[in-house]
């Protein structure tokens, strides 16, 4: 669909005569009839197949025709068509004299024709005007013409319909060839698909309008690239939605149980050493002079019973002082003035003289200790039970009650998860508190070394002299493909170059 436009510019009829040669009285009141039709090699009368149009009286004898497109659209003349423009045409322009006001053909005398021109040819759709001038013996007509597409029609022959829109069905304008040109922020065949915020995650985000990024369930953040952890997850993160992977030092399903109470809470006072001992629990090892669960209590210097051989301890500002019983002396009453003759050894201890009878030493029977065998042995004081085992005195002996997962006389052995040899392909098994772990040999992976993986035998760059390295997957060994001039399994040996010939 388009319009053939004809712009009449100037008509010259200096003598004011008709085609018959008869003069017009008083002058030739001139109007035009235009006929547009299909291309004919010889333009002949017949129907104006592309349309026709008449003008009012435009002037007398010779006159210029002013551009009157704004005031009623009479010049240029419009010949609309609603078919595909064929690219060729025939045009007939007749100038007529109007003696009266009635311009209908039947109202005019047959000899009222002033002049008639006919042209034919090719004409492409475009904005540029083609200027033409036709001259006869008595008249001259200057005019220009063009074919343009109607609104919303595009292309070389005005056959492509395109109507710009900005609604649910599309967001585009039309290009000169009739193709769609999406408005900024839209894409797709009909520009219906919004372009999301730059960086918006392809799978986890979407948008309903440009520069937007709406997150699918389980995702958050400006670009929907952060997963939402499980509801209630305290000290954990996620790599996919609704997970809770605990941060270092936290345990429990919701990572809310403190496995590193020592670091997070520093409960031990007065320089004591803190040891984590499970979820939310810890043990303080006090420095000398302190006691209590958190080593918060200062010990009296005498609480450690420093005075031996029955000496009595007295606290002093700068330490303590031992009052020794008869027969003993020294800072801790450790030296005796007694000899074996004084029977100083209790509980069946046997006395041995030392320093030519100047002193003695007691050899104590089992279950007794002290320089005079005066103390009963508490076999649990040395904390012999490992891994949190509980020490129990049983008369002359002792035993350890072990925590789950441990065994042995002193609970020193972890009940081995490795006993059933769970690691395949020669993997090495390690017992951990949380379970077991397999260290796999080269070429194997997986939790139990059950997956065979190919070794990159070329990783160590074993081939010399720019040779190409390949891994033989059947043997997991390297193969060197030598360049010209080198041999050997690693291409390390040069070969003799061919002799040079004198010609």
């Amino acid at each position: 669909s388009g319009v053939f436009q004809l712009q009449l510019q100037e008509f010259v009829n200096e003598r004011g005569v008709l085609a018959s040669g008869r003069p017009c009285e008083p002058g030739c009141r001139t109007f035009f009839r235009v006929c547009l039709k299909h291309f004919q090699a010889v333009v002949s009368p017949g129907p104006c197949t592309f349309g026709s149009v008449s003008t009012p009286v435009l002037g007398t004898n010779s006159f210029a025709v002013r551009d009157d497109s704004s005031g009623g659209g009479r010049n240029p003349l419009q010949l609309p068509f609603n078919f595909t423009w064929p690219g060729t045409f025939s045009l007939i322009i007749e100038a007529w004299h109007a003696p009266g006001d009635d311009l209908r053909p039947e109202a005019l005398p047959p000899d009222a024709l002033i002049s008639k021109i006919a042209i034919q040819g090719s004409l492409a759709v475009g904005q540029n005007w083609l200027l033409d001038e036709q001259t006869s013996t008595l008249t001259r007509l200057r005019y220009s013409y063009r074919v343009i597409c109607s609104d919303n029609y595009y292309g070389d022959n005005c056959s492509r319909l395109c109507k710009k829109r900005n609604d649910h069905f599309g967001h585009y304008v039309c290009q000169p060839d009739g193709n769609l040109s999406c408005l900024p922020g839209w894409t797709g065949e009909y520009c219906q698909q919004p372009i999301c915020l730059s960086g918006c995650h392809e799978q986890n985000g979407y948008c309903s309008k440009p520069a937007e990024c709406l997150c699918r369930p389980g995702w958050q953040g400006r670009l929907c690239n952060e997963c939402i952890p499980h509801n209630g997850c305290r000290h954990g993160t996620c790599s996919t939605p609704w997970q809770c992977t605990c941060d270092e030092g936290w345990g429990g399903l919701f990572c809310d149980q403190d496995l590193n109470y020592c670091t997070h809470h520093s409960p031990c006072k007065n320089g004591a050493t803190c040891s984590n001992s499970g979820q939310r629990s810890y043990t303080c090892t006090c420095r000398p002079g302190y006691t209590g669960v958190d080593c918060e209590l200062e010990l009296s210097e005498c609480d450690s019973n420093p005075c031996r051989n029955g000496g009595s301890c007295k606290d002093q500002e700068d330490g303590y002082h031992c009052l020794c019983p008869p027969g003993y002396y020294g800072l801790h009453c450790e030296h005796s003035t007694l000899s074996c003759a004084d029977s100083p050894c209790f509980n069946g201890g046997s006395c041995r003289e030392r320093n030519q009878g100047a002193s003695y030493a007691c050899e104590c029977p089992p279950n007794f200790t002290g320089s005079n065998c005066e103390k009963k042995v508490d076999r649990c004081t040395s904390n012999p039970c490992a891994n949190g085992g509980q020490c129990l005195n049983r008369g002359p002996s002792r035993m350890c009650r072990c925590r789950p997962g441990f065994t042995g006389t002193y609970c020193e052995r972890h009940v081995s998860d490795c006993a059933r040899n769970p690691c395949a392909h020669g993997g090495t098994c390690h017992d951990l508190e949380s379970g077991l772990m397999c260290t796999c040999p080269a070429g194997f992976s997986g939790r139990r070394c059950e997956v065979r993986t190919s070794i990159d035998a070329c990783a160590s760059s074993p081939c010399f002299n720019r040779a190409t390295c390949y891994t033989d997957l059947s043997t997991d060994t390297f193969v060197c493909n030598c360049p010209y001039g080198f041999v050997g399994s690693r291409c390390e040996f040069p070969v003799g170059l061919p002799p040079s010939f004198p010609w």
């Epitope: 499980h230 997850c233 954990g236 609704w242 997970q243 809770c244 992977t245 605990c246 936290w250 345990g251 429990g252 399903l253 919701f254 990572c255 789950p404 997962g405 009940v415 998860d417 951990l432 508190e433 949380s434 379970g435 077991l436 939790r447 139990r448």
Partner: nanobody, 120 residues
Framework: EVQLVESGGGLVQPGGSLRLSCAAS????????IGWFRQAPGKEPEEISC????????YYADSVKGRFTISRDNAKNTVYLQMNSLKPEDTAVYYC?????????????TGQGTQVTVSS
């Protein structure tokens, strides 16, 4: 595909008992710790109990200590939660979960849950 399916929930009177089961598939069962948590309407989820992959380490929340017992049968790929002396405040949806590792640290997969209602 990892799947955890809970069963055994229902309506029980205060003081009564229930035994919940969690049937697992899609992974090497005896490699993973399995735990139970519950969520009452409008409340945060609460961890109830967890058992390590070997079964040697078990954890119980203070609110259920002495009343609930967790156990696992590696041959049947199932974890059980025996709930005795039930109270109205135990009413919730009970979920089983695994951290995807041997120790009770985090949540990687959860089931769809089973409703437990304690009411007279």
């Amino acid at each position: 595909e990892v799947q955890l399916v809970e069963s055994g929930g229902g309506l029980v009177q205060p003081g009564g008992s229930l035994r919940l089961s969690c049937a697992a598939s899609g992974f090497t069962f005896d490699d993973y710790a399995i735990g139970w948590f519950r969520q009452a309407p409008g409340k945060e989820p609460e961890e109830i109990s967890c058992i390590s992959s070997s079964g040697g380490i078990t954890y119980y929340a203070d609110s259920v200590k002495g009343r609930f017992t967790i156990s696992r049968d590696n041959a049947k790929n199932t974890v059980y939660l025996q709930m005795n002396s039930l109270k109205p405040e135990d009413t919730a949806v009970y979920y089983c979960a695994t951290p995807g590792i041997a120790a009770c640290r985090g949540i990687h997969y959860t089931g769809q849950g089973t409703q437990v209602t304690v009411s007279s």
